[in-house]
């Protein structure tokens, strides 16, 4: 058996595909926090669902793949995802201190439905997550207002009818929510004083003003000749999580970089003896992304078929046949700013001191590319396109 | 599709122990709660017992308190009602029946093993000197 | 032990025609969740019990819409908008609210 990784890399790949073909802006996404949503789909469906949401996280090798598996195999492999999901959730949340990374899974259930102890014990064991009962049936506009304050609380943030009006009726019986925070310390920080207003090229004709924030500092950096692109690490405090962004040399650049992009490559990009410490001109916005997706429809287009029908088998969550996730939603949220661990001598040093010069320029004022990883699991936290302020 | 299906019942002389078994099929055993009920001739129902799915909780009417004991084996998808010092007001059919899911309250928290459905055929269990 | 009574204890009903049998606790079963923790079973002449109705007026898989429940607190009902002749058997109440669960003493239906 493989880990969940080449799985969910490729699932990452084929979810931001997906997204991109949907969204004209911005594309921001969580694969953790997908991940972990489904693992908690997963531990409440059997049979050919489950089979079929498995396979999105988990891959095995060929030979094993292909022959009929015993129902103890099944449920052994399954232990597994959501074991590995947990350590995950536990390791990723290790060194909090250092920064605010919120993930929140919540399932709200139609109040009249039996759900089954087991499930209700197992996803707050591995997901920490709970079931919210909810008046579908006689209140479903009152049950829409209520979701959508939960998910505000969940990252302080104003939503606008994140389910709007109607959305919900008296037939919905489960609804799915995966909200994912980050918010961290730069391991340098980038000195307020020389964030400056600058445009942002959306395309060759049309600009948007950002505030540019600017460091020249020691950065993992490497050219990739093949796409035209440069790419940087941007460690945070601890050097535990990075964020690295896929810059492409052209403002009109970033298509041909995606057209050519693939797991293994953003693997191999990313490895340590690919890119090398090099000083950078680093200028990149001070962003505030935030999407909301319904799941539903994505994950359909990318394999997962029977989860959101009414055949889905849910036999593990409830007795009760008929039951699905009617909505599955997940709202990502990511705040760039300068803040940072204090400067010290020898450490990342303020422009105006350093000649620019002799720094390589990584000036992120076109579309780009950035994702998130965390070192140790390895994991991949943020996916994102910033194409528009 | 769901089938349970006890055994173990007969004539036994008061004081005497009797183990039931209920066999389950066509679900996933380990993940329901799982009851006892009784129904002496003629009579109404009764509780007996409840326990959890992990076996872990365990719950009993106060008649059959200290001598009966409710107890599974999930590897082997059975339910099990050990029941000792039996008396004459023992006598009764014995269904097994699977938990039908918890009710959920405010996040997280649930009442779990209220409602029994399906039933087993059940199995007459006599005491009788 | 909550002690639940039923009335009546005999019920001579005509195909068609509705029915109504009710259900009293001794004390209270709405729990602080809101719910009421009633429910109904039959058990059919030499059948094992199903049950019908839970939570007061849920109906159980299956179950057809001509059965509904109703009533909350300490008293409670369940209808049959038009019998027919498969639904004759005993019906039972039971409170579902804390161990042990305890049963009505039954309401025979019959066709007439």
């Known amino acids: 058996m493989d880990s969940l990784g080449t799985a969910a890399t490729q699932f990452l790949f084929d979810l931001f595909k997906e997204l991109n073909k949907t969204n004209d802006g911005n594309v921001f996404f969580s694969p953790v926090g997908i991940s972990t949503a489904i693992g908690m789909i997963i531990l409440g469906t059997r049979g050919a669902t489950a089979s079929e949401l498995q396979k999105v996280l988990y891959t095995e090798q060929g030979t094993e793949s292909s022959r009929i598996k015993s129902e103890e195999e099944e449920i052994e492999k399954r232990e597994e995802i959501h074991h590995q999901l947990q350590m995950l959730l536990t390791e990723i949340s290790k060194f909090s201190n250092d920064y605010d990374l919120i993930i929140s899974n919540r399932l709200f259930g139609e109040k009249t439905y039996l759900f089954l102890q087991k499930y209700i014990d197992y996803v707050e064991k591995y997901y920490h997550a709970s079931l919210e009962p909810v008046d579908f049936v006689n209140a479903a506009d009152e049950s829409r207002k209520k979701i959508n304050s939960w998910v505000e609380s969940q990252t302080n943030v104003k939503v606008k009818d994140l389910f709007p009006e109607g959305s919900l009726n008296s037939s919905t019986k489960l609804v799915l929510i995966n909200t994912v925070y980050f918010k961290g310390l730069w391991d340098r920080e980038f000195k307020k004083e020389h964030t400056k207003e600058e445009d942002f090229w959306l395309n060759k004709n049309l600009s948007k003003p950002v505030q540019m924030m600017a460091l020249c500092s020691s950065f993992n950096f490497t050219f990739l000749e093949d796409l035209q692109a440069k790419i940087v690490g941007i460690p945070y405090k601890n050097n535990d999580i990075s964020m690295f962004v896929l810059l492409p040399n052209d403002i009109d650049g970033l298509e041909k970089i995606m057209d050519k992009m693939s797991p293994e490559k953003l693997v191999e990009w990313t490895s340590p003896g690919h890119l090398e410490q090099r000083r950078v001109d680093l200028r990149l916005p001070r962003l505030q992304v935030e999407e909301t997706y319904d799941l539903e429809p994505v994950l359909e287009a990318v394999g997962i078929h029977s989860a959101f029908s009414e055949h889905a088998d849910y036999s593990g969550m409830s007795a009760r046949s008929g039951l699905h996730a009617q909505n599955f939603l997940h709202r990502s949220f990511l705040v760039v700013t300068e803040e940072g661990v204090e400067a010290t001598a020898g450490t990342g040093v303020g422009l105006k001191v350093s000649s620019a010069a002799s720094c390589e320029l990584v000036h992120c004022n076109h579309p780009f590319l950035f994702f998130i990883r965390h070192r140790e699991s390895d994991s991949i936290l943020f996916f994102g396109k910033f194409s528009s302020p | 599709q769901v089938q349970l299906q006890e055994s173990g019942g007969g004539v036994v002389q008061p004081g005497r122990s009797l183990r039931l078994s209920c066999a389950a099929s066509?679900?996933?055993?380990?993940?329901?709660?799982m009851h006892w009920v009784r129904q002496a001739p003629g009579k109404g129902l009764e509780w007996v017992a409840v326990i959890s799915y992990d076996g872990s909780n365990k719950y009993y009417a106060d008649s059959v308190k200290g001598r009966f004991t409710i107890s599974r084996d999930n590897s082997k998808n059975t339910l099990y009602l050990q029941m000792n010092s039996l008396r004459a007001e023992d006598t009764a059919v014995y269904y097994c029946?699977?938990?039908?899911?918890?009710?959920?309250?405010?996040?997280?928290?649930?009442?779990?093993?209220?409602?029994?459905?399906?039933w087993g055929q059940g199995t007459l269990v006599t005491v009788s000197s | 032990d909550v002690v639940m009574t039923q009335s009546p204890l005999s019920l001579p009903v005509t195909p068609g025609e509705p029915a109504s049998i009710s259900c009293r606790s001794r004390q209270s079963l709405l729990h602080s969740n809101g719910h009421n923790y009633l429910g109904w079973y039959l058990q059919k002449p030499g059948q094992s019990p199903q049950l019908l109705i839970y939570l007061a007026s849920i109906r159980a898989s299956g179950i057809p819409d001509r059965f509904s429940g109703s009533g909350s607190g300490t008293d409670f009902t369940l209808k049959i908008s038009r019998v027919e002749a498969e639904d004759v058997g005993v019906y039972y109440c039971?409170?579902?609210?804390?161990?042990?669960?305890?049963f009505g003493q039954g309401t025979k239906l019959e066709i007439k």
């Open positions: 029946a699977r938990d039908l899911g918890a009710v959920i309250a405010v996040a997280g928290t649930s009442t779990p093993y209220n409602w029994f459905d399906p």
């Open positions: 066509g679900f996933t055993f380990s993940s329901y709660g």
């Open positions: 039971m409170q579902a609210l804390q161990t042990p669960y305890t």
